[in-house]
Structures are given as C-alpha cells and as structure tokens.
Interface confidence: medium
C-alpha cells in the first residue's frame, strides 16, 4: 500500500508523542497548582486537538483556539505579570525563584505548549509528524504561531497594575516591534487596568556599563506605551547572574549595591 500523499512544509514536524506530552503536562500542572485542581485535562486536550486537527494548517484562526482559551482561564494577581522578549530562559529562571510572578509559560496554556510544535492536515484526523508550516517560508497563520498570538493577547489583556517586561540588551533591536511582545502584547495591555510598564533591560557583557534604557528602540517602546496612557519605566540589569542571586537572597550585603 502506497503511503497517502502528504503536504510538505518547510518547518519541523509535530513534536513526537505530542498528545501524550500535552496530557501529561496538564495533569502535572493541575497537581502542582491547587487553584487549577479541578481542571479536566481530557477536555483540555480535546479542545487543543479541535483547534488544528482536520484543518488546513495555513488557515488557522484565533477563533479556532477560543474553546481552549476558555478552558484555560486563569488570572494573575495585579503587579505579578512578567512579559519577556528574546530572553525566555532568564525570565523563566526568575519566576522559578520569584514564585509570585508569572510568565505566560507559568500559566496552564503556556506550560502545555512551551517548546512544542504541532499541526494537522486538512480533512484527516491525523497529526503531521513529518513537517509543519514555517512562519517565514510557508505561512503565518499556522497552528503554533496562531496559538502563541492568541494566548499572548489574552495574557496581556488580563494583566493589571505594574506589568514587567524582560528585554535582551545584547540584541541589535532590544525592543523589536515584530516580536510577540512588540506586535501583540504591547498593544493589548489595557490602560484602564495597567498603571505602568517597567522594562528590565538585561545586559550581556560583564563590562557593559552603558545605559541601554537610552537605546532608540527603548525610546520607541516608551513612545508607544505613553501614547496608550500607560506610564513607562526602565531599569538596566547590568549583572543578570547577580540579579538572580539577589532575588534568591535579598539580604546578601552585595545586593544593596546596584545590579
């Protein structure tokens, strides 16, 4: 029997054991987060699957993910939202220490999908493990990109108080308008709920003492935020290693000086 013809995409295929991974992550999350203890993980998986299975993977919409978003409804306390752009690992290390702050990946839906790839095929119930659409080479309306756009929008919309964002000071564009933060989250912060956005610019080089808060892209971010009636603050984090250490041990005498 000849294998059925399958669309070839430019991106890597669905992560192996994707259904099992999502279900296992959901169960683990609900075990560790008592406020989500009654979430029915089978329903979550069914809604996740329903968003992309049997659908043309270049024609996925935010509407496809609404059933999943409803199931994963979660609220973050005011002042406890941490956004990030191009510096995921440090942001996650930070929230692992500062347990009362949350990135999107600390929430159920972000946790389920973090570092995974998935897509289906039009008119079949199969998951495509061979290839999935690449955002640049194939299409932007693919299952993974639309998922992150959808949940990022929701995460930003529900933020309140002072929102923090961690930015990578080693990149040419510290604030990139084309990133998820720059294209989705910034524009979905609600001025009636968010008093301020505080950017933490993370320095890469040990001898880098420049004030990266004066960077033109940060000024651009400040302009966008200010026009939306949200106050903007910026801090340089010159020593990310010391920064994390001081989050762990704030009483350390070396933490009284700047980081």
């Amino acid at each position: 029997v000849l294998p059925r013809w399958r669309q070839q995409w430019s991106g890597s295929g669905t992560t192996s054991r994707f259904p099992e991974t999502v279900l296992a992550r959901c169960v683990k999350y609900t075990e560790v987060h008592p406020e989500m203890r009654h979430v029915d993980c089978q329903s979550v998986w069914d809604a996740f699957k329903g968003a992309f299975i049997s659908k043309y993977p270049c024609n996925i919409t935010e509407e496809d993910y609404q059933p999943l978003v409803k199931l994963g409804t979660q609220t973050v306390p005011c002042n406890k939202t941490l956004l990030w752009s191009r510096i995921k690992d440090l942001a996650h290390q930070f929230t692992q220490v500062q347990r009362d702050m949350f990135t999107l990946e600390d929430m159920l839906l972000g946790y389920l999908a973090d570092d995974l790839t998935w897509c289906g095929e039009f008119n079949t119930f199969e998951i495509n493990y061979q290839s999935c659409p690449d955002w640049r080479k194939d299409c932007s309306n693919n299952p993974v990109s639309v998922f992150w756009k959808t949940v990022s929008r929701r995460f930003a919309e529900t933020a309140c108080g002072v929102v923090h964002v961690m930015l990578n000071g080693s990149r040419s564009k510290i604030f990139d308008k084309n990133s998820t933060f720059g294209s989705v989250e910034v524009h979905n912060l609600q001025p009636e709920k968010v008093q301020a956005l505080e950017a933490w610019v993370i320095h890469g080089g040990r001898e880098d003492s420049r004030d990266l808060c004066q960077d033109p892209t940060i000024k651009e971010l400040e302009s966008i935020i200010s026009k939306r009636n949200i106050r903007f603050f910026c801090k340089n984090i010159y020593r990310p290693d010391k920064f994390l250490q001081c989050v762990k041990n704030p009483e350390d005498s070396s933490c009284l000086s700047g980081i």
Partner: antibody, heavy 120, light 110 residues
Framework: EVQLLESGGGFVQPGGSLRLSCAAS????????MNWVRQAPGKGLEWVGI????????YYADSVKGRFTISRDNSKNTLYLQMSSLRAEDTAIYYC???????????????WGQGTTVTV | QSVLTQPSSASGTPGQRVTISCSGG????????VYWYQQLPGTAPKLLIY???QRPSGVPDRFSGSKSGTSASLAISGLQSEDEADYYC???????????FGGGTKLTVL
C-alpha cells in the same frame, strides 16, 4: 477516623455577627483545602467559600463576599467562618467539607461535617 | 437560580435504571471535573462520584457518572429503596471563580 465537627450555630438578629467553628480530626489538616457550604431550609446546597491549606488564599461566593471571612488555625486543627451583617437569607445549615488530595488527584468535598444551624 | 441545571425530581421502581442529568457551560462542566453528592433525608451530603466517573471506596458500582461537553449525568442501576435521596452535581467555575452546584434532584423509589 476522619471527622469534621461544626459548632457555633444559633439564633442571631439581622445585622448581627456569629462565628462558626469546624474541628477536624483523623487527617493532615495543614494540607487540606477546606470549604463552607450552606443549605437553606428545604433548598439546595450553596457553596460559601474555600480556604487553602496554609490560610493564605480564600475564595467566596458573591452572596457573602465582604460579610463573611474564612480563616483557620492549623495548630488547633480548626476552621472558622466569621459571619457579620447577617441577613434573613443567611438562615441555613452550615457544613464544613474537606477538599482532599489523594494519590495526586483531588477529590472535592469528600468528607462533610454534620452541620450547624444558623437562624437569622 | 443555580448555575448548573438538574431536573427537580426523578423516580423509578426497584431494580430499574435511573439517569439524572446536569447541564452547565464551557467555564464549568466542560472545563472541570464533575462531582456528584447524595444527601439522604436529614443527613449531610456524601461524595458519590468524583472526577466525572470515579467512585470513592464504599460506593456501590450501581452508581456511575459520565460527562460529555457541557453536560454530565449520574446513572443508578438496580435501584434500591435506600437510594431515595437528593442528588447534587457540582464543579468549579473558572469564570465566576466559585464552586457551583446544581439545584438538586429528588429521587423517589416507587
């Protein structure tokens, strides 16, 4: 044997206050989320609120928010419901119930007390 | 007015099978596990079914629970006179951030 025993019910004037207690025994009280549920005469069950194991998180039904406070004293294995600004519609049997975690899976309200009656 | 909808009454003869329905929405039944409670006359409620279909130890296998989408149901087979009681479904509601119960179903064994 796992047991919950409510006390503190009685008659109270509208606008008055009352504190209910729920004494727990036979299980690790510190880890258990605890609920208060009430039942008006001849009516169904109505959830009042819940408190987490260390007492740092509480959630309430809209009907009691701002008037009722759930607290706990883990050293005494006791759960409390402080009720103030009481109304006629708060008249009910008040039950405490445990949210249990077993083998990493949550039961909901797997053990209930016998209830204590509050009449406003 | 309860968030979850149950029939107010149900009845059956000994040995029969009776089903009680519980209808909700996407933020409660669809999202979360459903629990069923039995309240015998003059007593406190007792957990009958947890996580949609699981029975705590001591609950006879005549009682079974199921869930599909925004609805759940409790089935009692081989009905016995001691099953005469009020039955309540319950679950957490993610939007309201509260525990919600159905209005209760009074089961009569004829």
């Amino acid at each position: 044997e796992v047991q919950l025993l409510e006390s503190g019910g009685g008659f109270v004037q509208p606008g008055g206050s009352l504190r209910l207690s729920c004494a727990a025994s036979g299980f690790n009280f510190n880890n258990a989320w605890m609920n208060w549920v009430r039942q008006a005469p001849g009516k169904g069950l109505e959830w009042v609120g819940i408190i987490n194991g260390d007492g740092t998180n509480t959630y309430y039904a809209d009907s009691v928010k701002g008037r009722f406070t759930i607290s706990r004293d883990n050293s005494k294995n006791t759960l409390y419901l402080q009720m103030s600004s009481l109304r006629a519609e708060d008249t009910a049997i008040y039950y405490c119930a445990r949210d249990n975690k077993l083998n990493d899976y949550y039961y909901a309200m797997d053990v209930w007390g016998q209830g204590t009656t509050v009449t406003v | 007015q309860s968030v979850l909808t149950q029939p107010s009454s149900a009845s059956g003869t000994p040995g029969q099978r009776v089903t009680i329905s519980c209808s909700g929405g996407s933020s409660n039944i669809h999202a979360n596990y459903v629990y069923w409670y039995q309240q015998l006359p003059g007593t406190a409620p007792k957990l009958l079914i947890y996580r949609n279909s699981q029975r705590p130890s001591g609950v006879p296998d005549r009682f079974s629970g199921s869930k599909s989408g925004t609805s759940a149901s409790l089935a009692i087979s081989g009905l016995q006179s001691e099953d005469e009681a009020d039955y309540y479904c319950g679950t957490w509601d993610n939007i309201l951030n509260v525990w919600v119960f159905g209005g209760g179903t009074k089961l009569t064994v004829l």
